[in-house]
């Protein structure tokens, strides 16, 4: 039975040219996290963080994606095309797979405020 929940940074906004941290957190379960996959709105892979093998960064993003902090991702040099959904998929044992969603809006304006965190069951 899957008892865990994924908490994410929710809906966030950031300034064009700036950077943003995409972060998910798995709680309410003792399951072991074996891997976290980060994917974009079109289901293309941004990165993988395997507990033992470390990080895989999709080559198209190697100059703009920094691993971490933790199991999260830092997306740098933001463009307007980065606006959209991002998904964290937690592969766990023995629970199975948990998935969280973040919506990133990249703004032209100089002010970009982060919204409150929210939970996805």
């Amino acid at each position: 039975m899957m008892t865990g929940t994924i908490e994410t940074t929710g809906n966030i906004s950031a300034k064009k040219g700036g950077s943003v941290i995409l972060q998910c957190h798995l709680s309410s379960t003792m399951a072991q996290v074996t891997q976290v996959n980060w994917e974009q709105h079109d289901h293309s892979l941004l990165a993988i963080r395997n507990a033992e093998l470390g990080w895989h960064i999709y080559p198209a993003f190697k100059d703009r994606v920094a691993p971490g902090p933790g199991l999260g991702l830092t997306l740098q040099s933001l463009t307007m095309n980065d606006t959209g959904e991002y998904f964290c998929t937690y592969h766990t044992y023995p629970d199975g797979t948990y998935r969280g969603r973040i919506f990133l809006e990249v703004l032209e304006s100089s002010v970009a405020e982060h919204s409150a965190r929210f939970q996805i069951p």
């Epitope: 074996t34 891997q35 996959n37 994917e39 289901h43 293309s44 892979l45 993988i48 395997n50 507990a51 033992e52 093998l53 470390g54 990080w55 895989h56 960064i57 999709y58 080559p59 198209a60 190697k62 691993p67 592969h91």
Partner: antibody, heavy 119, light 107 residues
């Protein structure tokens, strides 16, 4: 030049163990994961597991059910793969391979070690 | 475990031919696919990763494409040194798994 040099061919009895070595050179050993892949005669490739020398992390293909152990000696830049409780189906060529940095692709491979299990 | 199914398992072609090999994953693997080339008695060599980036030194006649579950390796103009067996592999989730291989033979 990146090189992975493996130990020589082995002939083993069923039920015994074999330990294959893989000596790395031409790069910083702790910066790249080492994987082990095997290939039975006339068959395809099968991933056995990997070892991350950066933090001594190991991951195994559960199909081997605890029969495989991957270790390394960082002082000599050498990785090891030990397979126990050998059976005839374990007759294969065993390869070590290095993973590219920040990429789950095996970019350099050892020459292979033939392990024959026969009574 | 994710199954990777390659087709065809073998093909005969002539020098200069355009050759296409396909690989289908049993479930979504995004762009986490790699292609290797192996010649008899030799270790595999990395050709293409992620799944359209050529590894260092790989000729431009080799190209890869696909996403999700369906992937393709194309050799635009087959050369004598290209006769070999080609394998796809997924690293979307462990255990990493390979396709059964496609043997490219001389017609």
């Amino acid at each position: 030049e990146v090189q992975l040099v493996q130990s020589g061919a082995e002939v083993k009895k069923p039920g015994s163990s074999v330990k294959v070595s893989c000596k790395a050179s031409g790069y910083t050993f702790t910066e790249h994961v080492i994987h082990w892949v095997r290939q039975a005669p006339g068959q395809g490739l099968e991933w056995m597991g990997g070892f991350n020398p950066n933090h001594d992390g190991t991951i195994y293909n559960q199909i081997f059910r605890g029969r495989v152990t991957i270790t390394a000696d960082k002082s000599t830049s050498t990785a090891y793969m030990e397979l126990s409780s050998l059976r005839s189906e374990d007759t294969a060529v065993y390869y070590c391979a290095r993973a590219a940095k920040l990429l789950f692709a095996m970019d350099y491979w050892g020459q292979g070690t033939t392990v024959t299990v026969s009574s | 475990d994710i199954q990777m199914t390659q087709s065809p398992s073998s093909l005969s072609a002539s020098v200069g031919d355009r050759v296409t090999i396909t690989c289908r994953a049993s479930q979504h693997v995004s762009n986490a696919v790699v292609w290797y080339q192996q010649k008899p008695g030799k270790a595999p060599k990395l050709l293409i990763y992620s799944p359209s980036y050529r590894f260092t030194g790989v000729p431009s006649r080799f190209s890869g494409s696909g996403s999700g579950t369906d992937f393709t390796l194309t050799i635009s103009s087959l050369q004598p040194e290209d006769f070999a067996t080609y394998y796809c592999q997924q690293h979307y989730s462990t255990p990493w798994t390979f396709g059964g291989g496609t043997k490219v033979e001389i017609k």
